[in-house]
């Protein structure tokens, strides 16, 4: 082509018209273009209708083009990725009718001040939405209702002061939420729902620590290893979880997850009864903790990091770049598992290596053993993710045999001294508090770290189990045994055929036994 560079990559005809000082679409582009780069031109206004002859177009880059207006007319039936970042758009065009197949939309670093309620109507395939670096102050409550497949949402670096309570409702596949660097002072009760959110970025907001923050405090405690700090240009391997990065603005940068909440109602962070499946604040009586339980829900598909997919042995991995243009469609069944209050098992959980089978329910009942009094360590604020092997950009192909699990150096938290545990209160008696031993991990890659995240005082008492806990015998890889502290109390049962429509535990799940 006389103006643009034409090449092919993996059967995609890629046309690069970047930095050509173009003011309009160049004429006579190849009709079979699948990827079109028009970045860093001087387009000012652009009509998507001009691209209708390019029926194979799957990716369009219009970033850094000084766009003040994008005309949406015609239809681009297979366009999956649209990059409009670093432009001057003051309103988000209604793309639904024009781009019905859109999976990735990047409108970062524009001049959006608000979004209309129906801004995303018709974008039912959208998986990634990037709105970072705009001037958004509020969001309409049902903004994301039309995008149930959303996996990544970035609202970072805006002027958001509040969030609608139901913003994330129905987003069962959401794995990455970026809310850092806004003006948020609280999180409405029930905001996060009950599904697992592996990657949340929440720092750089003026969190107001009062009784209204207790729901958020509780969520942070339960999801400590899922809260990360965003560092521009930092390699994924160096990203660390850091729940302490979420700090009270009115309390000398005190971490929200440690906010004492003195004087607040006992059940102040319970919120609506369905938030944690009847999951109240611990009510301590002397040295005992009343029976409570946590619901850990596994999303319906392989987890992804903010930087790419966690490749499942059974799921073909797709584009590892971010934003990526395509994602897996294979789903595993939704799983729900109960664990003791305020902590998740201290082992490395490899979501990509667990393939849940649609088989009749299978349960394992561990045998309880005598009570021991043990301190449960406070979450270490900084936990570094294990280095992925292989890199997300070059995973093992699914046609190759899955490698056997190996056991690398375990990633464990600093073990507190037996007699002086970090959560100060009464020192736990030495004889009954052996030092926690590291938990072995199954090395697959990449990994999600899930480790003990308890804020229960040292005098909390759990019954222990000696029998390994298995989620499902028919899984391709099972979770490592839970035979080290912290101990699991009572019986853990999993009914792994729960209905997609039932947000609560199946009746067959056994409760945690009260003391």
């Amino acid at each position: 082509h006389p103006i643009c560079e034409v090449s092919k990559v993996a059967s995609h005809l890629e046309v690069n018209c970047d930095k050509r000082n173009l003011t309009a679409l160049p004429p006579d582009l190849p009709k079979d273009t699948t990827i079109l780069h028009l970045s860093e031109n001087l387009l000012y206004t652009f009509s998507l209708a001009t691209l209708m002859p390019y029926t194979r177009l799957t990716q369009l880059n219009l970033d850094r083009c000084e766009l003040t207006k994008l005309q949406v007319d015609g239809t681009l039936p297979v366009l999956g990725t649209l990059d409009l970042s670093h432009n001057q758009l003051q309103s988000l065009p209604l793309l639904g009718q024009t781009l019905p197949a859109l999976t990735v939309l990047d409108v970062s670093f524009n001049r959006l001040t608000s979004l209309p309620l129906g801004a995303l109507r018709g974008l039912g395939e959208l998986q990634e939405l990037y709105l970072k670096g705009n001037e958004l102050k509020t969001l309409p409550p049902g903004l994301l209702t039309p995008t149930p497949k959303l996996e990544k949402l970035s609202l970072a670096n805006n002027n958001l002061t509040e969030l609608p309570a139901g913003l994330l409702n129905g987003l069962e596949n959401l794995d990455t939420l970026l809310l850092q660097e806004n003006s948020l002072y609280t999180i409405p009760k029930g905001f996060f729902g009950s599904h697992l959110l592996p990657f949340a970025f929440l720092h750089g907001n003026p969190w107001l620590c009062n009784c209204e923050i207790l729901y958020f405090r509780r969520w942070l405690q339960d999801n400590a290893e899922n809260v990360y700090v965003w560092k521009q240009g930092v390699d994924v391997k160096a990203m660390t979880s850091n729940v302490a990065s979420v700090q009270c603005d009115n309390s000398d940068k005190f971490p929200v997850y440690k906010y004492p909440g003195k004087g607040c109602p006992t059940l102040g962070d319970e919120g609506d009864t369905d938030l944690y499946d009847y999951y109240p604040e611990e009510d301590t009586e002397g040295d005992k903790v009343r029976a409570t339980r946590t619901v850990v829900k596994f999303p319906t598909k392989a987890h992804t990091t903010p930087w790419g997919l966690f490749y499942s042995w059974s799921t073909a991995s797709l584009d590892s770049q971010m934003p990526s243009s395509l994602h897996p469609t294979q789903e595993s069944t939704k799983e729900q598992t109960t664990f003791p209050p305020r902590w998740t098992p201290n082992f490395t959980l490899h979501m990509e290596s667990i393939t849940f089978s649609k088989t009749p329910k299978s349960t394992t009942e561990p045998t309880p053993s005598p009570t021991t009094s043990e301190p449960v360590p406070e979450p270490a604020p900084n936990m570094t993710t294990l280095e992925p092997t292989p890199s997300p950009t070059t995973p093992e192909p699914t046609s190759e045999p899955a490698p056997s699990p190996t056991t690398p150096e375990p990633t464990s938290e600093p073990a507190p001294s037996p007699t002086t545990p970090e959560p100060t209160s009464e020192p736990a008696p030495s004889p009954t508090t052996p030092e926690p031993t590291p938990i072995p991990t199954i090395a697959t890659s990449p990994t999600i770290l899930v480790s003990a995240t308890s804020l229960i005082t040292p005098k909390s008492t759990f019954l222990t189990t000696t029998k390994p806990v298995s989620l499902l015998e028919s899984t391709k890889k099972t979770i490592p045994e839970l035979d080290q502290p912290p101990k699991l109390r009572g019986v853990l049962q999993g009914h792994l055929e729960s209905s997609r429509n039932d947000p609560f535990l199946h009746p067959d799940f056994c409760c945690l036994l009260p003391l």
Epitope: A10, S11, L318, S325
Partner: antibody
């Protein structure tokens, strides 16, 4: 049976021009990408140019601006117009068919020799 | 451009014995969208045009004997002949069909001892 027959090779002086043709039969020519691959005497294979079924050409840097690939679907013929020829362009030029939209070559012609020499 | 490097450049073989040729690429040929490695193998018999043996690393072309097999992922690939026959002599080329410009290895000459 798929057949690819090249013609148009010969001796040409440096700076000169030559046009190669490839007559295709035994398949729906218009549906497939086509390519030229060359092999210098005693050397390995080198891709020269491709054209998609929709007519989009692309080239390596070594021939960009000097060679032009084209096709006439009505004649089931692939062409390679070679200008500003150099001694290093001396090679056997093969016409090759791609499978679908992929870029490996499932059928090759017998080749035509182009010699650039003064 | 992606550089393809083959080894060995010459491979004397005994009929009935196995043979193996290595091909390395300067960057990954794995398309993470579909988990395919975009690598093909060709055989050019003496005095003939090249013929396709294997594409997408391990898929045998129709009519190619099953004694030929391809494997590998990312940047390291291998062509194996389980039992070499006399008709297998010639020059074997690997080619990446991942990213233009399409590039070939230097070739491995297989000859009977």
């Amino acid at each position: 049976e798929v057949q690819l027959v090249e013609s148009g090779g010969g001796l040409v002086q440096p700076g000169g021009s030559l046009r190669l043709s490839c007559a295709a039969s035994g398949f729906t020519f218009s549906s497939f990408a086509m390519s030229w691959v060359r092999q210098a005497p005693g050397k390995g294979l080198e891709w020269v140019s491709s054209i998609t079924s929709a007519g989009t050409p692309y080239y390596p840097d070594s021939v960009l601006g000097r060679f032009t690939i084209s096709r006439d679907n009505s004649k089931n013929t692939l062409y390679l117009q070679m200008n500003s020829l150099r001694a290093e362009d001396t090679a056997v030029y093969y016409c090759a068919k791609s499978r679908g939209y992929e870029d490996y070559f499932d059928y090759w012609g017998q080749g035509t020799l182009v010699t650039v020499s003064s | 451009d992606i550089v393809m490097t083959q080894s060995p450049l010459s491979l004397p073989v005994t009929p009935g014995e196995p043979a193996s040729i290595s091909c390395k690429s300067s960057q990954s040929l794995l398309n993470s969208r579909n988990q395919k490695n975009y690598l093909a193998w060709y055989l050019q018999k003496p005095g003939q045009s090249p013929q396709l043996l294997i594409y997408f690393t391990s898929t045998r072309e129709s009519g190619v004997p099953d004694r030929f097999s391809g494997s590998g992922s990312g940047t390291d690939f291998t062509l194996k002949i389980s039992r070499v026959e006399a008709e297998d002599v010639g020059v074997y080329y690997c080619q990446q069909h991942y990213s233009s410009p399409w590039t070939f290895g230097q070739g491995t000459k297989v000859e009977i001892k």
